[in-house]
């Protein structure tokens, strides 16, 4: 069994977690991918997933979570905007590959969100505000219900994450609503 490792990120309320999960292999490019939370004693819970097949550079938004799959670089970008203290927890990216178990992308992310916003130098709180004001088209999320608590074979290289300031005031309430976010060049 592969040893589970974690990367810890300590952020303030209102900030954005920006994680890049590295899946490396072309065979995974079109596979459906998901962002899950792992709570003690529970099965991993899928919070958001890409489409099936996963579309290239096509943002999918579920509440305050935005997934964007970059096939050409083997990266799944996960953003959780306007973080709340209750978002603290252990997260992971997985690749669905039915009928096999989901393929977990290492490392897991240990997110710790604390009270009190602390702005970063040169940051703009409204930098992407307009993106989320565009009238959304919504559809039902088609995330597989099955999740496995077990880990899967080999681990691709680590994910990386960085920090930015708040992007919006979207609340993570109805996780079945997906918003297509236009891409601006």
């Amino acid at each position: 069994a592969t040893k589970l490792t974690e990367e810890k990120y300590e952020l303030k309320e209102g900030q954005t977690l920006d994680v890049k999960c590295d899946y490396t292999l072309e065979k995974f490019a079109s596979s459906q991918k998901a962002w899950q939370i792992i709570r003690d004693g529970e099965m991993p819970k899928t919070l958001a997933c890409t489409e099936r097949p996963s579309k290239n550079s096509h943002p999918v938004q579920v509440g305050r979570i935005i997934l964007e799959d970059y096939h050409d670089h083997g990266l799944l970008r996960v953003r959780m905007v306007n973080l709340q203290v209750e978002d603290s927890g252990l997260y992971q990216c997985v690749i669905y590959q039915p009928p096999k178990e989901p393929h977990m992308l290492f490392d897991r992310i240990r997110l710790v969100v604390t009270k009190g916003f602390s702005g970063t130098p040169g940051s703009n709180e409204n930098s992407t505000q307009n993106v989320y004001k565009i009238p959304p088209t919504t559809t039902k999320a088609l995330c597989p219900l099955y999740t496995s608590p077990r880990t899967v074979t080999q681990a691709p290289p680590k994910s990386t994450a960085d920090v930015s300031t708040p992007d919006s005031e979207i609340n993570l309430t109805n996780v079945t609503d997906i918003i297509r976010v236009p891409v601006f060049n």
Epitope: D22, L25, E26, A29, Y70, H71, D72, H73, G74
Partner: antibody, heavy 121, light 111 residues
């Protein structure tokens, strides 16, 4: 252990053709893109091109200097990549290396020993 | 095409001293916070050997006197304490965009 072995090099006249092979072992060949890199004597490295996997419809990409003259192909059942070189020029004289990356747009972790192609009349 | 320019073209450093090689890209080789810039070492008669991948990650089995840094367009390969076996030509290479490209190489010698 990953091994890449190039073959097919030799002396060819300008305007002629040559087909290089790269026999791979020690890994799941069909999973990775394969690349060709060349090096003229005493000169630097030049990326020639790459072929992606079946998942990416075996898409190929080439350096401008060889586009339209060179063709990269692969046979996953034989664990072999190929470089078909047509309309050869004297400036194509070089050692040709076969390389394997570590995944999508990743680094070249594995290299063959190279095969020498000499284009001369 | 992304042009990679290495400096200097050649470098002579005393044993035990620090060697620094720079690589400048004509445009960014970053995608998000990943720099798709790698460093290779090549000795005469041998194929290149990977030293550093994605700007700063040390390849398995490579001595830790080698390190890489940088992002965007400016990158550096550093050998903290030059050893005799480090005499070679060093190349940077980008894979962020097709066509992939190499720097022209830097020849490292002992002073």
């Amino acid at each position: 252990e990953v091994q890449l072995v190039e073959s097919g090099g030799g002396l060819v006249q300008p305007g002629g053709s040559l087909k290089l092979s790269c026999a791979a072992s020690g890994f799941t060949f069909s999973t990775y893109a394969m690349h060709w890199v060349r090096q003229a004597s005493g000169k630097g490295l030049e990326w020639v091109g790459r072929i992606r996997t079946k998942s990416s419809s075996y898409a190929t990409y080439y350096a401008a200097s060889v586009k339209g003259r060179f063709t990269i192909s692969r046979d996953d059942s034989k664990n072999t990549a190929y470089l078909q070189m047509n309309s050869l020029k004297t400036e194509d004289t070089a050692v040709y290396y076969c390389t394997r990356d570590m995944g999508i747009r990743r680094q070249f972790a594995y290299w063959g020993q190279g095969t020498l192609v000499t284009v001369s009349s | 095409d992304i042009v990679l320019t290495q400096s200097p073209d050649s470098l002579a450093v005393s044993l035990g001293e620090r060697a620094t090689i720079n690589c400048r890209a004509s445009e960014s080789v970053d995608t998000f916070d990943y720099s798709f810039l790698h460093w290779y070492q090549q000795k005469p008669g041998q194929p290149p050997k990977l030293l550093i991948y994605r700007a700063s990650n040390l390849e398995s089995g490579v001595p830790d006197r080698f390190s890489g840094s940088g992002s965007g367009t400016d990158f550096t390969l550093t050998i903290s304490s030059l050893q005799a076996e480090d005499v070679a030509v060093y190349y940077c290479q980008q894979s962020n965009e097709d066509p992939y490209t190499f720097g022209q190489g830097t020849k490292l010698e002992i002073k």
